[in-house]
Each structure stands twice: as C-alpha cells, then as structure tokens.
C-alpha cells in the first residue's frame, strides 16, 4: 500500500488503490506496529550504546522471547498455514508482559510506547478471528506474567536498557516473520 | 521456480516508441503482495528503476520518467508490458524486468529476467 | 527524486572482510537491499529488507542498517564476490524505487 501521510515507508508493499481486504488490512496494521517500533528502537539507542553491541553479546540473556523457528512453518521453506498461524499468536500473546514492561521505559515516546501496546492487542483480535477453528493456542498465565513483570522492573539500570533493546529488536524480528508468513495466508 | 522473459525490438528509431514484454511462468502476476517493475542499465552504467505494476493492476513510475513510460499488463498470458515513448539515443539499455515478491517486505526484487538489450538509433 | 550514495570502488585482499556502505535520507525509512552484479549478467538479490539473506546466497554475505546508512559486509571475501554491487531502497514516497550509483568491489591476491 501507498504510504499514508504520517505513516513511514519502512512498510512500502507496492502501490494500492483498490479498498483493503482482510490481509491488507492486517498487513498494514502490522506495518504501523512495526513504525512504531523503529521510533522506539531510535529512543533507546540515543539513550545507550546498546545497538552498537553485537548480537553475539547481547545473546547471553535469560529473557524467553518469542522466536520464529523452522518447524513453526513460517518460513518459506516448510510452510504451513496452520502450524504458523498459531505459532504468530502464541507468540504475540508472550510478548504482551513484555510490551507491558515497555510502558514505563521511554520518555519523550511515551505515547508510541501505548501505541504500540494497543495495536498488538488489536492486531491478536484479528488474528484469533482469522484462527477460530484453531484450538492449539495457549494463552500464558496471569500469574506467571505478573511475576516476570516484577523481576524485570527489579534489575538494574543496566540491564532494564538492554532488556528494553532486546525486546524491541526481537519483536520487530517476530513481526516481520509475521508479515512475510501471513501474506501467504 | 518463477521466471522471467524479456522480449521486443532491439533496435528502436529515435522519436518512435519503445515496447517491451515481460512473460511470467512459475507464479501469477496477480499474486497477492507481488508487484512487477522495470529496470534499465545503459552500457557501463549502472541500474534505473522505471516503474512497477502491482498485484491488483496499480501503477507507479519513476519521477524522472514519468511523463513517458506506461506499464500495463495482460493476466491471460500473464505478462506485464512497457512502453516508454519518443525514445533517444540516451535510452539504449539493457532493460529487465523483476519481480517484488511477498516475502520481501521493502521494495526488493528477488527475481529478474536476463535482460534485453536496445538500442535507440536511425 | 533523492539518490543513494555509494564509494564507486572498493579493493580487497582475498580472506579480507569487506564493507559496502550506502548512504541516503530515505533509508531511515526504508528498507534496504543489495544487488550483486557480473559482468553480462542480471543483478542478484544478496540481502533484502535490511538484514535478511536470500536462500542460496552464502552466509558471508549480511546486512546492516542504522539511521540513514546500510552496509553490506563480506566476511572472507571470496575471488568470485568480484563484481558490482547496487544497493536499493524505496523513495520517501514508499512507491518508487531507488538504486544506488554501484560499488565495483575487487579482490586481490
């Protein structure tokens, strides 16, 4: 889709003139996320030196974030509708306590930070809708959740910076997975 | 495995109007999120986008080019065409077509034809 | 429209790394990818949107992208990684295309 005014072109798909159906719709929904989470990614490596560290270094951390593997089938070799589409949820159902952990860390993208929250939430919704005959997604535990969320707020300075980039990076790398996989859907 | 055939005139008189087909086989023109553009290379030069024809039959041109480049296309046989008119010496290229797939989320092109050369002249 | 800017030549020593940078305003915004080129033939798509590498492209070859500039790396660059290499990205409008001007990598030794 054409860009939008007030949009970034980081979600160039091709010009579109027609209404949107269902899957541009969600494509372009996952394209204002993924705005979002440039404008964040921005904040926090003007904050820290954080993206000039190496994957490798940043690698060794305890964080469970959500990742794209081969027998998910979201990939393009070994595709399969099904298994990817509840592999997209799940994932994205993970990352919400983490998404509620970004909510205090920025400051001049406050609002982006909500923005980016909001949308994830609204972008489940359309997923579960598009997966109602699906039944293997499972849904993580409030408790567990409201435990983790704590631990995260209680590490140092440090750590909070790089568990803010962590999160940030491998979430726009889910999304993209994401993006790619359900174009094919 | 989709592939891409340029074909047209390889010479073209100064003035005249330019006109190149590009024929798909492996994957439709009218898949979702693909979209279609043309590159030109003069001789020992480097690449120009001229324009893209999406999925759903939308067009879009390079600015430069704009004022003369057209770009539509044929589903039934799925091929994407161009024309660029009053043609000079300045447009001999070598002119492929390529393609944009879905699972690139930028404006990549991760197929291309050989290419065909053209050469403008009298 | 505004193009990208990138060195017409580089040289290096054969095992060396290598890495092409390209520079311009519409890639904080947009994606980049990289095209290698031999002489008589199409370009190939070696790194599409940023940092993701084609089926088929050795792991050598990766991506980078920060603020307005993209880099393409070859780690132990091989003889045959001798070529021209375009970067590519959309306009600010998101609807055009833009290359860059083309980089002639040589490795010697």
């Known amino acids: 889709a054409p860009v939008l005014p007030g949009e970034d072109s980081k979600d160039v798909a091709a010009p579109h003139s027609q209404p949107l159906t269902s899957s541009e719709r969600i494509d372009k929904h996952i394209r204002y996320i993924l705005d979002g989470i440039s404008a964040l990614r921005k904040e926090t490596c003007n904050r820290s030196n954080m993206c000039e560290s190496s994957k490798e270094a940043l690698a060794e951390n305890n964080l469970n974030l959500p990742k794209m593997a081969e027998k998910d089938g979201c990939f393009q070799s070994g595709f399969n509708e099904d298994t990817c589409l509840v592999k997209i949820i799940t994932g994205l159902l993970e990352f919400e306590v983490y998404l509620e952990y970004l909510q205090n860390r920025f400051e001049s993208s406050e609002e982006q930070a909500r923005a980016v929250q909001m949308s994830t939430k609204v972008l489940i919704q359309f997923l579960q809708k598009k997966a109602k005959n699906l039944d293997a997604i499972t849904t993580p535990e409030p408790t567990t959740n409201a435990s983790l969320l704590t631990k995260l707020q209680a590490q140092n300075q440090w750590l909070q910076d790089m568990t803010t980039h962590l999160i940030l990076r491998s979430f726009k790398e889910f999304l993209q997975s994401s993006l790619r996989a359900l174009r094919q859907m | 495995e989709v592939q891409l055939v340029e074909s047209g005139p390889g010479l073209v008189k100064p003035s005249q109007t330019l006109s190149l087909t590009c024929t798909v086989s492996g994957g439709s023109i009218t898949a979702s999120f693909d979209a279609w553009s043309w590159i030109r290379q003069p001789p020992g030069k480097g690449l120009e986008w001229m324009g893209v024809i999406a999925y759903d039959g939308s067009t879009y041109y390079s600015p430069s080019l704009k004022s003369r480049t057209s770009i539509s296309r044929d589903t039934s046989k799925n091929q994407f065409s161009l024309q660029l008119s009053s043609v000079t010496p300045e447009d001999t290229a070598v002119y492929y077509c390529?393609?944009?797939?879905?699972?690139?989320?930028?404006?990549?092109?991760?197929?291309w034809g050989k290419g065909t050369l053209v050469t403008v002249s009298s | 429209q505004a193009g990208l800017t990138q060195p017409s030549a580089l040289s290096v020593t054969l095992g060396q790394t290598a890495k092409i940078t390209c520079q311009g305003g519409?890639?904080?915004?947009?994606?980049a990818h990289w095209y290698q080129q031999k002489p008589g033939q199409a370009p190939v798509l070696v790194i599409y949107?940023?940092?993701s590498r084609p089926s088929g492209i050795p792991e050598r070859f990766s991506g980078s992208s920060s603020g307005g500039r993209a880099t393409l790396t070859i780690s132990g660059a091989q003889a045959e990684d001798e070529g021209d290499y375009y970067c590519q990205s959309a306009d600010s409008s998101g609807n055009a295309a833009v290359f860059g001007g083309g980089t002639h990598l040589t490795v010697l030794g």
């Open positions: 519409s890639l904080g915004s947009s994606y």
């Open positions: 390529a393609r944009k797939s879905s699972w690139l989320i930028g404006y990549g092109m991760d197929y």
């Open positions: 949107d940023d940092d």
